[in-house]
């Protein structure tokens, strides 16, 4: 806390400018009007304030807006955002995607902080669902964002938003998350033709049921082994040797290299040896 002291004569700030970097903490507290700061927040980022000085500026805003900052101030917080606690952010009502982008830009290149996580949570809850533009923005800043959500949170993602998802956005998703996302992707891409559909749906197939894999096996899709290895065990086990051969196409030879790994191992174990022998790969059931 900075003590309340009178502003020295001639030091009263008329605007937020570089002269303020020479002010001591107590002078900033005494001489900068909080309302002036709020209206000129966009200038703060252009001025090389010390962390201690930024603490004072935050304190002034906290006093002016004890119930939480208005969005007009939040949008221009810039590096002052890094001084905010999750508790501060929970008081905010952020509705503009531009505001969200501006604050994410401040944290760019770093892992998602508790502050950013809270900000995103507030924003998404305010919107009611993860729309395409929001998802586009979040995955651009944090490719792993989608996979950081619980299956329950993912259920609020509308199928239309799935178009914004890139394969790398799903890299760290676990099977339970893909179980939620796959039906949405299937719905989103349902009007595409066979080969185009497979390209889009491929990243989501870790949530696909057996019947969908059987259907894909009839379409000459040539699934690669990396995708096959991510399929649900319960979806793979009922597939016949012939179906797996059709599903993988020329990639079927890759089964040999993965025979000790799941789910390939689980599938091999449950096939008739005579059927496995038709592949000519030396797989032992």
């Amino acid at each position: 806390e900075v003590e309340k002291t009178a502003c020295p004569s001639g030091k009263k700030a008329r605007e937020i400018d570089e002269s303020l970097i020479f002010y001591k903490k107590w002078e900033l507290e005494a001489c900068v009007d909080a309302a002036l700061l709020a209206t000129q927040m966009d200038r703060v980022n252009a001025i090389p304030f010390t962390y201690e000085q930024l603490d004072v500026l935050k304190h002034k805003l906290d006093e002016l807006y004890p119930q939480g900052y208005p969005e007009s101030v939040i949008q221009h917080l810039g590096y002052l955002f890094l001084k905010m606690s999750p508790e501060d952010i929970r008081k905010w009502n952020v509705t503009s995607l531009e505001t969200l982008k501006a604050l994410l830009e401040v944290n760019k290149g770093h892992e998602m902080s508790p502050q950013v996580a809270t900000l995103i949570d507030r924003f998404v809850k305010g919107r009611g669902q993860l729309d395409k533009d929001t998802l586009d923005t979040l995955t651009a800043f944090y490719p792993g964002y989608l996979c950081s959500l619980s299956p329950e949170e993912l259920s609020s993602v509308p199928p239309s938003s799935i178009w914004a998802v890139r394969p790398q956005d799903l890299d760290t998703c676990d099977p339970r998350q893909l179980d939620v996302l796959y039906p949405k992707a299937r719905l989103a891409f349902q009007n595409m033709n066979g080969s185009e559909y497979f390209v889009k749906i491929q990243s989501f197939l870790g949530g696909a049921p057996t019947e969908d894999l059987k259907a894909l096996s009839q379409q000459n899709v040539s699934m690669d082994l990396a995708t096959f290895m991510k399929l649900r065990t319960d979806a793979v086990l009922p597939l016949t040797v012939a179906e797996v051969q059709k599903l993988l196409g020329p990639h079927v030879e890759g089964l040999k290299a993965e025979e000790r790994h799941r789910p390939v191992r689980d599938w091999i174990l449950r096939q008739r040896q005579d059927d496995l022998d038709t592949l000519g790969l030396g797989l032992q059931g």
Epitope: D174, D234, H261, R265, L269
Partner: antibody
Framework: QVQLQESGPGLVKPSETLSLTCTVS??????????WSWIRQPPGKGLEWIGY???????NYNPSLKSRVTISVDTSKNQFSLKLSSVTAADTAVYYC???????????WGQGTMVTVSS | DIQMTQSPSSLSASVGDRVTITCRAS??????LNWYQQKPGKAPKLLIY???SLQSGVPSRFSGSGSGTDFTLTISSLQPEDFATYYC?????????FGGGTKVEIK
């Protein structure tokens, strides 16, 4: 519900063969989804997986024990068995049989049987 | 073989504490990671399978996360009956391996 029960001698002499049987009750050893494992735990130490068998007779063993281990299954008796040859004092442990459900893991265990290797 | 490294090997905690145990695989094991609880003189008990799925009958204070090589078991609010040894186990590779265990003791 499925239960497992280990049986066999509690004392084996060095260089001899350790033999244990696990009896499955309340379920079938011929289950499509399950393999049947043996796991051991030396006194005061961690868990070591020995190997598993599928009802078809397919087996998979821990590479470090493979040369000494044989696991077999008797579907008519609803049992599976472990044989560990050329035992030494280092094989003294609590031996567990367990069901390995393909979707979950070792979800059902026997209560364990202590086997001591000593002359 | 895939090596599983657990940390810490032991920890002291109080009832009500949040406890986190980590498990690292020497290579990627996707989500094929299970967690077990073992009490003295008893067989292990499955808590979490497939890295994050709660086994039927296990209290919701237990949760698991992670994929690839790094995994975490969290007990959100430690209860008296939770003092035990915890093991992770990979089932991705045909040669199953367990972590060395983490003993959770009363502070």
């Amino acid at each position: 519900q499925v239960q497992l029960q280990e049986s066999g001698p509690g004392l084996v002499k060095p260089s001899e063969t350790l033999s244990l049987t696990c009896t499955v009750s309340g379920g079938s050893v011929s289950s499509f989804t399950d393999t049947w494992s043996w796991i051991r735990q030396p006194p005061g130490k961690g868990l070591e997986w020995i190997g598993y068998i599928y009802y078809s007779g397919s087996t998979n063993y821990n590479p470090s024990l493979k040369s000494r281990v044989t696991i077999s299954v008797d579907t008519s008796k609803n049992q599976f068995s472990l044989k560990l040859s050329s035992v030494t004092a280092a094989d003294t442990a609590v031996y567990y049989c367990a069901r390995d459900n393909v979707f979950t893991g070792f979800d059902i265990w026997g209560q364990g049987t202590m086997v001591t290797v000593s002359s | 073989d895939i090596q599983m490294t657990q940390s810490p090997s032991s920890l002291s905690a109080s009832v009500g504490d949040r406890v986190t145990i980590t498990c690292r695989a020497s290579q990627s094991i996707s989500s094929y990671l299970n967690w077990y609880q073992q009490k003295p003189g008893k067989a292990p008990k499955l808590l979490i399978y497939a890295a994050s799925s709660l086994q039927s009958g296990v209290p919701s204070r237990f949760s698991g996360s992670g994929s690839g090589t790094d995994f975490t078991l969290t007990i959100s609010s430690l209860q008296p009956e939770d003092f035990a040894t915890y093991y992770c186990q990979q089932s991705y590779d045909a040669s199953y391996t367990f972590g060395g265990g983490t003993k959770v003791e009363i502070k």
